[in-house]
């Protein structure tokens, strides 16, 4: 807390400018106008402030606004955002994607701090789902977004949200995400075609029950062996040799190199050893 | 419910062999979806798994393990087995049978069988 | 072999405390990394699955997290029967292996 004093005379600030660089702080305390401040928050950033200085101001903007500040303030609150705690972020109500983007933009290039995870919280429970405009801004500024929600948070993401995922912002999704995602993926793409659909689907393959992973072995979609080495064992155990074989097309000379690795061991264990051999890979079940 | 339980000696003498069967009940061995393991844990120290072996006899062993071990199942019997060779002091440990589910893990243990390997 | 590395190997804590412990693998596992908890003198008893998925009759308290070859097991709200020792297991290679452990003591 910083010491109530008179302001020097003439030491009154008319405007937020560099001359309060060489202000102490109790001169900041005592010769700034939170009201002022408020108005001029887009100039702060301009200013070389100091950390302690940065203190001062914050702590002026919680006396003038003990309830949460307005968004008008928030939008240009720059790097003081940094001196923000969750519980000061709690108070908030940010609609506007451009208040986020400009908060954001702070911390880019910095892995989510609690200060980011609660912002983002507060902004998609205010807009109550996760709409295609803010998952394209989250997954833009952290790739990870999707996978940090749990299950029951990604059960809010609408199908046409889908259309902003890129295949990197699955990379750290657990089978419990790609569960929920998935039947979204599948609703959002159905429109397209075969070869269409699988280049947009395939991300999502994680989540994908057996049914659909035979659907597209009748398809000569020739999946990778990273993607199905992502599918979910319970999904994999039932398919044949056959249905695998469709299903990897060119890519099934992989198996052999993934032959002890999880779903393609269990996989293998499951087969009868004269329908492996048709594969002419050595497989030992 | 599953339940699985181990037999065999407690002590055995060094450069011996060390032999274990477990005993599945409520259950069957010849599931298709589980493996059926060994693990140990020597005194005061962590876990090691062995090797498992499926119904169908196909096995897999740890590589630090693998030329003195030998895992069989009789599913007649609804148990598998460990043998263990050329036994030193440093195979001392509480044995454990355990489960290994495909979709799951390790979900199902004995209550454990401590051998000791001393002359 | 894929190695499994847990930390910390020991901690104090606090009925009440928030409980995180880590586990890494020497290459990605995907998500077949399972939590076991362990009490002295008895079995292991499988916590978490699946990386995140608990197991039938576990307390919600628990939860797991990550993908690829970080993982962090979390106990929101420590209580009298969590002091135990935890290990991590990975079950993508056929050569299974367990961390090192991680013993959760009382402050």
């Known amino acids: 807390e910083v010491e109530k004093t008179a302001c020097p005379s003439g030491k009154k600030a008319r405007e937020i400018d560099e001359s309060l660089i060489f202000y102490k702080k109790w001169e900041l305390e005592a010769c700034v106008d939170a009201a002022l401040l408020a108005t001029q928050m887009d100039r702060v950033n301009a200013i070389p402030f100091t950390y302690e200085q940065l203190d001062v101001l914050k702590h002026k903007l919680d006396e003038l606004y003990p309830q949460g500040y307005p968004e008008s303030v928030i939008q240009h609150l720059g790097y003081l955002f940094l001196k923000m705690s969750p519980e000061d972020i709690r108070k908030w109500n940010v609609t506007s994607l451009e208040t986020l983007k400009a908060l954001l933009e702070v911390n880019k290039g910095h892995e989510m701090s609690p200060q980011v995870a609660t912002l983002i919280d507060r902004f998609v429970k205010g807009r109550g789902q996760l709409d295609k405009d803010t998952l394209d801004t989250l997954t833009a500024f952290y790739p990870g977004y999707l996978c940090s929600l749990s299950p029951e948070e990604l059960s809010s993401v609408p199908p046409s949200s889908i259309w902003a995922v890129r295949p990197q912002d699955l990379d750290t999704c657990d089978p419990r995400q790609l569960d929920v995602l998935y039947p979204k993926a599948r609703l959002a793409f159905q429109n397209m075609n075969g070869s269409e659909y699988f280049v947009k689907i395939q991300s999502f393959l994680g989540g994908a029950p057996t049914e659909d992973l035979k659907a597209l072995s009748q398809q000569n979609v020739s999946m990778d062996l990273a993607t199905f080495m992502k599918l979910r064992t319970d999904a994999v155990l039932p398919l044949t040799v056959a249905e695998v074989q469709k299903l990897l097309g060119p890519h099934v000379e992989g198996l052999k190199a993934e032959e002890r690795h999880r779903p393609v061991r269990d996989w293998i264990l499951r087969q009868r050893q004269d329908d492996l051999d048709t594969l002419g890979l050595g497989l030992q079940g | 419910q599953v339940q699985l339980q181990e037999s065999g000696p407690g002590l055995v003498k060094p450069s011996e062999t060390l032999s274990l069967t477990c005993t599945v009940s409520g259950g069957s061995v010849s599931s298709r979806d589980d493996l059926w393991s060994w693990i140990r844990q020597p005194p005061g120290k962590g876990l090691e798994w062995i090797g498992y072996?499926?119904?169908?006899?196909?096995?897999n062993y740890n590589p630090s393990l693998k030329s003195r071990v030998t895992i069989s199942v009789d599913t007649s019997k609804n148990q598998f087995s460990l043998k263990l060779s050329s036994v030193t002091a440093a195979d001392t440990a509480v044995y454990y049978c355990a489960r290994d589910n495909v979709f799951t893990g390790f979900d199902i243990w004995g209550q454990g069988t401590m051998v000791t390997v001393s002359s | 072999d894929i190695q499994m590395t847990q930390s910390p190997s020991s901690l104090s804590a606090s009925v009440g405390d928030r409980v995180t412990i880590t586990c890494r693998a020497s290459?990605?596992?995907?998500?077949?990394l399972n939590w076991y908890q362990q009490k002295p003198g008895k079995a292991p008893k499988l916590l978490i699955y699946?990386?995140?998925s608990l197991q039938s009759g576990v307390p919600s308290r628990f939860s797991g997290s990550g993908s690829g070859t970080d993982f962090t097991l979390t106990i929101s709200s420590l209580q009298p029967e969590d002091f135990a020792t935890y290990y991590c297991?990975?079950?993508?290679?056929?050569?299974?292996?367990f961390g090192g452990g991680t013993k959760v003591e009382i402050k």
């Open positions: 072996i499926y119904y169908s006899g196909s096995t």
């Open positions: 699946a990386a995140s």
């Open positions: 290459q990605s596992i995907s998500s077949y």
């Open positions: 297991q990975q079950s993508y290679d056929a050569s299974y292996t």
